[in-house]
């Protein structure tokens, strides 16, 4: 079996990626500069640490979480890093152009890097549904379209609905999930005979996927609190996220055992279910007034995640061609919706509690935001799927799905590596 990259892609990928990188460098040269203000250095380091947490989540957390395939673990980790690196660059420029550009140059601050990392994270969530079925050239397209779609969605939501950075970024869960699922729906689905083993998980890659889940678990409070405006809101977000993910771990492991006839624990269920609380609590993490509510939400999210992992893969595999272990897409879509519903419930309670009218209007605004996020995700996802199906990208043949050897040089070309 030849490990050579298809000749056409070998020409296409470096040219496409390096031309794009050169264009990005030129854009940075002409349109950006650093924030010139002299800040308290200790404060700067503290502020950078949040960005660092997000980068760890993206590069290690999501990188390894998607690496559970027997023969596609190298590609999962490295392609994630590639997408993150490209996505952050484009997101910084795009956010700057959309929010600052009329005033001249785009000012790059630690906050803009933080925002860009979170935008790039969206792609890493979505790509779980298509990893193994696309090459790097196609992933470049996916990064550009998704980051652009998310950036524009956030701008539209902030202008029309007047929501803050946190709220319009927390639509990322639902957006990324539906984007990924709609891209997957457009790609060739059948796995031909003889390739079934490739989309199975193996022990060592599964362990690295668990490592990814652990990193995400540890840093999820940073993600949910990164864009909040005041320290008290951040504190609430950190505490509530921590309680929610703690409970979802307990629920995931016990629920997974409960769901198995012999009481065994499924690696796949646990990988994603441990994060369930963090996703479900994301939108409203700063609004939840007491720990027990966050814990109940973590419990419900863990159960939904395990239930989803048990019953949805069959449907997703048939309809979307998503392998059993790539459950992040439908997991995040369900939990993201749960989070949005919880936010609306809290909004109603809050409006009533404050003795203020306009409940219907507030709910309508929130439903409008959510609907817009889903519609834009589906439309841009379908557009991306159609673009990825173009012949120019030389997509891997279905028989080469989930195969590292198509993309990587291995000294002995051992099948079992």
């Amino acid at each position: 079996m030849s490990s050579k990259y298809p000749r056409s892609v070998r020409r296409c990928l470096p040219l496409w990626a390096l031309t794009l990188e050169a264009a990005l460098i030129l854009l940075f040269y002409f349109f950006t500069h650093y924030d010139a203000s002299l800040e308290d250095q200790k404060g700067l380091v503290a502020s950078y640490q949040v960005g660092q947490d997000l980068t760890v989540m993206a590069a290690i957390g999501l990188g390894f979480l998607t690496s559970s395939f027997r023969r596609h673990s190298w590609s999962s980790v490295a392609f994630n890093l590639f997408m993150l690196a490209l996505g952050v660059q484009w997101a910084i420029l795009l956010d700057g152009f959309l929010s600052q550009f009329p005033s001249g140059k785009v000012v790059i601050t630690l906050f803009s890097i933080r925002l860009a990392t979170m935008s790039a994270l969206s792609v890493l969530i979505s790509v779980d549904a298509v990893l193994g079925k696309v090459n790097l050239a196609q992933l470049v397209v996916m990064v550009l379209v998704e980051v652009t779609a998310l950036g524009n969605l956030r701008m539209v939501i902030s202008n029309i609905f007047n929501t803050d950075y946190h709220m319009n970024m927390m639509h990322i869960y639902v957006f990324a999930a539906y984007f990924g699922l709609s891209v997957a729906w457009c790609l060739p689905k059948p796995l031909p005979e003889g390739t079934e083993d490739k989309d199975q998980t193996a022990t060592i890659p599964s362990l690295s996927a668990m490592l990814g889940a652990l990193f995400l678990w540890m840093f999820w409070p940073s993600f949910n609190s990164a864009l909040l405006r005041s320290p008290i809101e951040r504190k609430n977000a950190v505490f509530n996220t921590y309680y929610a993910v703690a409970v979802s771990v307990v629920t995931a492991i016990s629920g997974s055992s409960l769901a198995h006839p012999q009481g065994k624990i499924s690696k796949t269920y646990v990988h994603s279910a441990v994060l369930a609380g963090g996703v479900a609590v994301g939108t409203s993490c700063h609004l939840i007034p007491s720990p027990w509510l966050a814990m109940v939400l973590g419990l419900v999210a863990g159960l939904i995640s395990v239930g989803g992992a048990k019953y949805l893969p069959g449907c997703c595999n048939r309809v979307l061609g998503i392998p059993h272990s790539s459950i992040m897409g439908y997991n995040f879509s369900l939990l993201g919706l749960l989070g949005e519903i919880i936010y609306i419930v809290l909004l109603v309670l809050d409006t009533v509690g404050a003795g203020n009218g306009m409940i219907g209007f507030q709910v309508l605004l929130s439903i409008g935001e959510l609907s817009l996020a889903i519609v834009i995700a589906l439309m841009s996802g379908l557009l991306t799927g159609l673009l990825l199906n173009l012949k120019i990208w030389k997509a891997p043949h279905e028989a080469k799905y989930f195969d590292d050897q198509v993309f990587w040089k291995f000294p002995h070309l051992a099948v079992g590596f």
Epitope: S47, F111, N162, M167, L365
Partner: antibody, heavy 126, light 107 residues
Amino acid sequence: EVQLLESGGGVVQPGRSLRLACAASGFSFRSYGMHWVRQAPGRGLEWVAFTWFDGSNKYYVDSVKGRFTISRDNSKNTLYLEMNSLRVDDTAVYYCAREASMLRGISRYYYAMDVWGPGTTVTVSS
Amino acid sequence: AELTQSPSFLSASVGDRVTITCRASQGIRSYLAWYQQKPGKAPKLLIYAASTLQSGVPSRFSGSGSGTEFTLTISSLQPEDFATYYCQQLNNYPPFTFGPGTKVDIK
């Protein structure tokens, strides 16, 4: 006692620079977002700039973007406004103000400028 | 969002009920604050979140509204209330605009 005190104002020629400082005392400065607001003679209040509590995010009114820079030193409990390429229409009393996050209802936080300094006068004149 | 205040000037007597209106060009939910400023002094916060009274502010001041239309009401005007009143939107994005102000004068 919670206090803000501006300094650094004065008379300056158009095109020149000036640096305003705002010293905070009586509260945990690093836990609050901070604003600069100005008021031209006989006119209303105009918001100028804002920095988040950790200095990670900053906003400016369009008329000063690219000319003014807001910054803070949390170790010195001080807020700054670096003003370059000053114009005659920048003449005003400059106030620094603390942004508080205040709870209303069950869990929602709202923002308002709850503590203000007495102001410092900046006159741009040739 | 642009804010407009009406009236811009108001003459009233001690004991009068005074209402000042603030309109936003786009919905700002309840992210509105009201300030009082006396000549030569810094502004003072009266109301935040459109309707919540800041601690230490007399209960004769009240605020209402949500979305685009807000009002500040002084139920019984006192001598120390003669000042200029500003509304301000502290929504999620800049500019955190102030209204042009309403000057309340002695009739």
